[in-house]
Amino acid sequence: ESLGWDIAELQLNHTGPQQDPRLYWQGGPALGRSFLRGPELDKGQLRIRRDGIYMVHIQVTLAICSSTSTSRHHHPTTLAVGICSPASRSISLLRLSFHQGCTIASQRLTPLARGDTLCTNLTGTLLPSRNTDETFFGVQWVRP
Amino acid sequence: ESLGWDIAELQLNHTGPQQDPRLYWQGGPALGRSFLRGPELDKGQLRIRRDGIYMVHIQVTLAICSSTSTSRHHHPTTLAVGICSPASRSISLLRLSFHQGCTIASQRLTPLARGDTLCTNLTGTLLPSRNTDETFFGVQWVRP
Amino acid sequence: ESLGWDIAELQLNHTGPQQDPRLYWQGGPALGRSFLRGPELDKGQLRIRRDGIYMVHIQVTLAICSSTSTSRHHHPTTLAVGICSPASRSISLLRLSFHQGCTIASQRLTPLARGDTLCTNLTGTLLPSRNTDETFFGVQWVRP
């Protein structure tokens, strides 16, 4: 681990209560193909333990969704990945709207610091799929 | 190669016969910008030769497609990437539907083992583009 | 830097004049979370300084966009990432159309050589968002 190869791939555990837009994640071989090697989970949110530049990636699929599902709703469904704590470093890193689609997927490189907690906020009232091949979230340390 | 930097980027060769949903891939500098450095192709399917955690990525674009093309058809067009052999390790790793779009693209981290063969199944009856900048599939070893 | 860990993550600076479909990028900690560590910018275009296989990724979101925005226009809005110079190596690496969506995001592995300049061409007449969490472009050296 001293190489700094911190890496994690998480699967969706559950959504938050009504006023909490955060997705709650889980990881570990017992759960399937998810894992945490370096980063850790704090109440379902991913916390970074090593400074560096990370590749952050995510895919979220809406449950029992058709192309009309997303257009039926008045409020757009949007997924944002950001640093939510510490508050001094709070920032949105990656944001996507579903529009007439049922899946969003993206990735980006970003500097993260030890202690940064990443939150994935799903706004709107559509439930995400918990299928492990449809909804997942991961980070990979790529360099100091 | 002893560093374990196994890596491959493939381009679409052809689709399978009617009852075979698999896409058949090809790779090599003579074909363009595709390559195999470590992994190998077995009848158009990608076989892993080194254990580790891999970043798997894919983009598939449907041929001569407009936003109405995908909604014309009764059956949804879906792309699934999975381990198809050995049978004991068969699992879907990544799944996306086209809905009213013409391209899907995603990526994920997943543990793979030597001998795992990855299949990319395109269900539905729409022909994928063979343009090398529109349809491609790759893996990158990222850590043990 | 001798490890060859060249890496860059850029944010959108501006679009080109009317007949120039290229997006112009900027990077640096003073601008936010964008950075250049190895590659460099030449008039807003990304130039590679080290040979190798790179993971290229991009996300582009159209400004003030709804799912009807993209279908309103006669000409499709398409994003292409390619090597634009030197002319002898000019090629399209990655191409996506927006169709009825407002965001495209993808990634691929590709060999790049020192001196290759990457261009991101946005065809159509829709303005991209300059929000740093909605539109970004990056490369990561992954192996020789």
Partner: antibody, heavy 120, light 111 residues
Framework: QVQLKQSGPGLVQPSQSLSITCTVS????????IHWVRQSPGKGLEWLGV???????DFNAAFISRLSISKDNSKSQVFFKVISLQANDTAIYYC??????????????WGQGTSVTVSS | DIVLTQSPTSLAVSLGQRATISCRAS??????????MHWYQQKPGQPPKLLIY???NLESGVPARFSGSGSGTDFTLNIHPVEEEDAATYYC?????????FGAGTKLELK
């Protein structure tokens, strides 16, 4: 085996409408699109329109105002109608199954054809 | 609309020889790594029969003496060796965009 059988009148009065039914067997209309093509000595083969497995339609712009295509999946029937026929609409009308790939737009099986004469 | 021009309009070929039919499109019908050109055979009193799809792919059940080639705007159907049952009219059809259009046909007769 795959079959497409057409039924419809052979003679139509000018300004009247033409209705043809294409009844299919050996496959489901929820999986395949059905094209309509006509053939006349003067104009050769002309593509008229298609109804897709999902029920949506595409038409040749030259006929869009006169043409309708619908279907009943449960009865495996496709209904084709042209209004305001004139003498130059005299032709053999065919239904044809879209090939396996939905975006290929080639016809791999055809009906036997309905010979239509427009005359008073 | 894309116009397809077939040549020749008719040809006579001896049994066992090669028949070559050309189809030229008014603009490219190649896209997405494919050529969206198809070939049909039609005998009197019968509907057309699909022979070749995507320029060079043989439809199931069609004899291997039929072959297709070409890309962009220029396409060719070859029959070799020609057999008696090949006497028919041959049509090209594109599917690059709507509307689909057909060539005017080439009538193949046996000498």
């Amino acid at each position: 085996q795959v079959q497409l059988k057409q039924s419809g009148p052979g003679l139509v009065q000018p300004s009247q409408s033409l209705s043809i039914t294409c009844t299919v067997s050996g496959f489901s209309l929820t999986s395949y699109g059905i094209h309509w093509v006509r053939q006349s000595p003067g104009k050769g083969l002309e593509w008229l329109g298609v109804i897709w497995s999902g029920g949506s339609t595409d038409f040749n712009a030259a006929f869009i105002s006169r043409l309708s295509i619908s279907k009943d999946n449960s009865k495996s029937q496709v209904f084709f109608k042209v209004i305001s026929l004139q003498a130059n609409d005299t032709a053999i009308y065919y239904c044809g199954r879209n090939s396996y790939y939905g975006n290929l737009y080639a016809m791999d099986y055809w009906g036997q054809g309905t010979s239509v004469t427009v005359s008073s | 609309d894309i116009v397809l021009t077939q040549s020749p309009t008719s040809l006579a070929v001896s049994l066992g020889q090669r028949a070559t039919i050309s189809c030229r499109a008014s603009k490219s019908v190649s896209a997405s790594g494919y050529s969206f050109m198809h070939w049909y055979q039609q005998k009197p009193g019968q509907p057309p029969k699909l022979l070749i799809y995507l320029a060079s792919n043989l439809e199931s059940g069609v004899p291997a003496r039929f072959s297709g080639s070409g890309s962009g705007t220029d396409f060719t159907l070859n029959i070799h060796p020609v057999e008696e049952e090949d006497a028919a009219t041959y049509y090209c059809q594109h599917s690059r965009e709507l509307p689909l259009t057909f060539g005017a046909g080439t009538k193949l007769e046996l000498k």
